[in-house]
Interface confidence: low
C-alpha cells in the first residue's frame, strides 16, 4: 500500500492521490474517535472542487447522521444522507472508500455503509484527500484490489 | 457574511495580563478549528495557538506555552486568549483566524486584529 | 527566527512571472503536511492565496500558483499586475502539531 506510514498524524491530513482515483482503489483510513466527537469529514479533491465528500456528523439537531455531497465551482450540490452511523465517540474505526467505475462504495469497520455515484467523472484528476474532524489519525493509505 | 472580529487589545505593563475576544459569525463555529496569530510592529506572521471545534485538540508555540491559554465558547460563537505575563516583545496586533477542513487546514478566514502593547 | 525560510524580496516588472520559494524540513514542508501561502497588503490582514500545497480558494485568480517538491515549497505569480505588490507568507504544519510560518517575502512591482 501506498500512504502515509502507522501512527499519529496530524488532522487535517493530506494523503496525495498521484494520478487520481482509478477503478479498484481501495483507500484505508484508521484512526480513533475523539470522545464527544462533533464531526469527521473525508474530502476527495479535485482541484478547489470536492468530488466526493464524506461528513458523519454526530449531533446535527440532535441526531447522528452522515452527510455525502459535492462541492463544484465553490457550491455544494444536493445533499445525500445516510442514517446507518457506525462510528462511537472514542472508538476505533476502519473507514475503506473502494473506487468502482461510476461510485465510491464505503465500507466501516469491515461492513457495508453507502455507495456515492461519482458526479465529478475525471477520476484521474482527484489527486487528494482531505482528512479533518475530531479522530486521532493512525494510517491512511491506498492500494489497487 | 463569514466574520471574525477580536477586541481587548489594550496597552499593558509588563507583568500585566489581558483577555482578547473574537466574536466570529456566517459560519457554523462550532466545525471549524481556530487560530491566534500575531504580527510584531513590522515584522512577519507568528502562530500562537490553535484548538479545534470540540476544545480537546489544543496547541501552542513553543514561546507563548505556560504564559497564554486558548479557549471557546461555541454557544458564544467565541474565541478567548489569555495572555499572562506579558513582555515588551509580545507588543503586536493578534489575529484571530479560522482554519477550514474545506480549505485543507489553510487559514482562510482573518479578523481584522487587534493590537496589544506592552509597555512600561 | 522563522523554521521556513523565504528570499526577504523579489521583484518583476508587470507581465513578466516570478517565484517565490519556502524552503523547511522532513518534519514541515517535506512530510504530508499542508502548505499554504499569504497574501499580506500593508495595514491589512493576510489573505490565503493557496491551501493543501496547490489549490486556490474561490476568488483568488488562476495567476497564482503552488507547487511543492521535497522539502520545499514555491508560489508562482504569472502575469505580474501592480496590485500584486504585497507580502506573501508561507505557512506548514509540523510534526509535533503546531504551525509554523516564513520570515514573509516582499514582492516589489519594479
Known amino acids: 500500500p501506498y500512504g502515509a506510514p502507522a501512527g499519529p498524524l496530524i488532522v487535517p491530513y493530506n494523503l496525495p492521490l498521484p494520478g487520481g482515483v482509478v477503478p479498484r482503489m481501495l483507500i484505508t483510513i484508521l484512526g480513533t474517535v475523539k470522545p464527544n466527537a462533533n464531526r469527521i469529514a473525508l474530502d476527495f479533491q479535485r482541484g478547489n472542487d470536492v468530488a466526493f465528500h464524506f461528513n458523519p456528523r454526530f449531533n446535527e439537531n440532535n441526531r447522528r447522521v452522515i452527510v455525502c455531497n459535492t462541492k463544484l465551482d465553490n457550491n455544494w450540490g444536493r445533499e445525500e444522507r445516510q442514517s446507518v452511523f457506525p462510528f462511537e465517540s472514542g472508538k476505533p474505526f476502519k473507514i475503506q472508500v473502494l473506487v468502482e467505475p461510476d461510485h465510491f462504495k464505503v465500507a466501516v469497520n469491515d461492513a457495508h455503509l453507502l455507495q456515492y455515484n461519482h458526479r465529478v467523472k475525471k477520476l484521474n484528476e482527484i489527486s487528494k484527500l482531505g482528512i479533518s474532524g475530531d479522530i486521532d489519525l493512525t494510517s491512511a493509505s491506498y492500494t489497487m484490489i | 457574511e463569514v466574520q471574525l472580529v477580536e477586541s481587548g487589545g489594550s496597552l499593558v505593563k509588563p507583568g500585566g495580563s489581558l483577555r482578547l475576544s473574537c466574536a466570529a459569525s456566517?459560519?457554523?463555529?462550532?466545525?471549524?478549528?481556530m487560530n491566534w496569530v500575531r504580527q510584531a510592529p513590522g515584522k512577519g506572521l507568528e502562530w500562537i495557538s490553535s484548538?479545534?471545534?470540540?476544545?480537546?485538540?489544543?496547541y501552542y508555540a513553543d514561546f507563548v506555552k505556560g504564559r497564554f491559554t486558548i479557549s471557546r465558547d461555541n454557544a458564544k460563537n467565541s474565541l478567548y486568549l489569555q495572555m499572562n505575563s506579558l513582555r515588551a516583545e509580545d507588543t503586536a496586533v493578534y489575529y484571530c483566524?479560522?482554519?477550514?477542513?474545506?480549505?485543507?487546514?489553510?487559514?482562510?478566514?482573518w479578523g481584522r486584529g487587534t493590537l496589544v502593547t506592552v509597555s512600561s | 527566527q522563522s523554521v521556513l525560510t523565504q528570499p526577504a524580496s523579489v521583484s518583476g516588472s508587470p507581465g513578466q512571472s516570478i517565484t517565490i520559494s519556502c524552503a523547511g524540513t522532513?518534519?514541515?514542508?517535506?512530510?504530508?503536511?499542508?502548505v499554504a501561502w499569504y497574501q499580506q497588503h500593508p495595514g491589512k490582514a493576510p489573505k490565503l492565496m493557496i491551501y493543501s500545497d496547490s489549490y486556490r480558494p474561490s476568488g483568488v485568480s488562476n495567476r497564482f500558483s503552488g507547487s511543492k517538491s521535497g522539502n520545499t515549497a514555491s508560489l508562482t505569480i504569472s502575469g505580474l499586475q501592480a496590485e500584486d505588490e504585497a507580502d506573501y507568507y508561507c505557512s506548514s504544519y509540523t510534526s509535533n502539531s503546531a504551525r509554523v510560518f516564513g520570515g514573509g517575502t516582499k514582492l516589489e512591482i519594479k
Open positions: 483566524v479560522r482554519s477550514s477542513g474545506y480549505s485543507g487546514g489553510g487559514m482562510d478566514v
Open positions: 484548538i479545534d471545534g470540540s476544545s480537546r485538540s489544543i
Open positions: 456566517g459560519f457554523t463555529f462550532s466545525n471549524d478549528d
Open positions: 522532513s518534519s514541515d514542508v517535506g512530510g504530508s503536511y499542508n
